[in-house]
């Protein structure tokens, strides 16, 4: 067991690394290192991560497991996948809600909150793109409704109501005076 600067481990298999005195086999994912091996090429003493902790990778040096993240209820997050010994909790948004990133350069680990998806039907519009990673994309007004300002207005049910040009085009009425 030669020098002290990361010597090559002459052990069968490649998952050995010098930990102190000896080249030891590391711990599998989901296990932490309780004690290194006590003879060359030996097995380290590895213990399963306790509940609510995890280690996602094989390792030689982690003497404790990482604490599982808790989904942020204040941000309306829910657990899409519960934490296991080998994987952290996967937080996301419940159906009908979408992820709004809290930073401009958004990556998977970025902080986020959940926003309720726009209900196109309630706005009397077609759903052009269903809400998942971003908000719902609403399209044109539903049949029986016409564009008026920012919203969709119901076609008049009688000739007594006013029907501007756009209304007439959609609803089939002539403008009444």
């Amino acid at each position: 067991q030669g020098g002290t600067r990361s010597p090559r481990c002459d052990c069968a298999g490649d998952f050995h690394k010098k930990i102190g005195l000896f080249c030891c086999r590391g711990c599998p994912a989901g296990h932490y290192l309780k004690a290194p091996c006590t003879e060359p090429c030996g097995n380290s003493t590895c213990l399963v991560c306790p509940q609510d902790t995890f280690l996602a990778w094989e390792n030689h040096h982690n003497s404790e497991c990482a604490r599982c993240q808790a989904c942020d209820e204040q941000a309306s997050q829910v657990a899409l996948e519960n934490c296991s010994a080998v994987a952290d909790t996967r937080c996301g948004c419940k159906p009908g809600w979408f992820v709004e990133c809290q930073v401009s350069q958004c990556v998977s680990s970025s902080p986020f909150y959940c926003q309720p998806c726009l209900d196109c039907g309630a706005l009397h519009r077609h759903t052009r793109l269903l809400c998942s990673r971003r908000d719902t994309d609403c399209g044109t007004c539903l049949p029986g409704f016409y564009e008026h300002g920012d919203g969709c207005v119901s076609c008049p049910t009688s000739t007594l109501g006013s029907c501007p040009e756009r209304c007439a085009a959609v609803c089939g009425w002539r403008q009444m005076f």
Epitope: G3, L21, L33
Partner: antibody, heavy 120, light 107 residues
Amino acid sequence: EVQLVESGGGLVKPGGSLRLSCAASGFTFSDYYMSWIRQAPGKGLEWVSYISSSSSYTNYADSVKGRFTISRDNAKNSLYLQMNSLRAEDTAVYYCASNVDTAMVGAFDIWGQGTLVTVS
Amino acid sequence: DIEMTQSPSSVSASVGDTVTITCRASQHISNWLAWYQQKPGQAPKFLIYTASNLQSGVPSRFSGSGYGTDFTLTISGLQPEDFATYYCQQADSFPLTFGGGTKVDIK
């Protein structure tokens, strides 16, 4: 209570032999590595030898290599040091030591009270 | 072999003082360093492992630090029972080696 008790020390002539024993109790002896460490009168600590839990690996200080042999009997919870061709400079208190509580291999968290070997 | 050099070899101090002992390794040993306390006629007592971790039951006035080649044992607020000799020991490679010891005595 975790305990190590050495025995077998005494006065021996240069060139003579002695066998030290260390009796372990209070822990699962067969699970842990063991070592002998010595201390010459009025001097510091000197590591002598190491043996793994299964006896498959041993290591010695250069000063004792070829003269001393470390061994263990897990069935008897005992560690041994066979010392041959003893020299005056081997005069020391000999401690057996192990590590039952710490994730640092090669450190020693339990020690015996020591047994004195005098070569004269 | 890795040589462990302790300094000072002795230090005189009073109860309540802070005492610092240094240990230097002749090669890089990461954090594979232990500290022991020994009183006359007694076996050494394990204090600190992996350079900075306090062994259970050891008073918190003892602390260790360092990485690589330079290490320190600090006793903050020396107590009467702390007057003893202190040894560092490397466990990075065989042969295991100890420092020469630092005797802490009463001023």
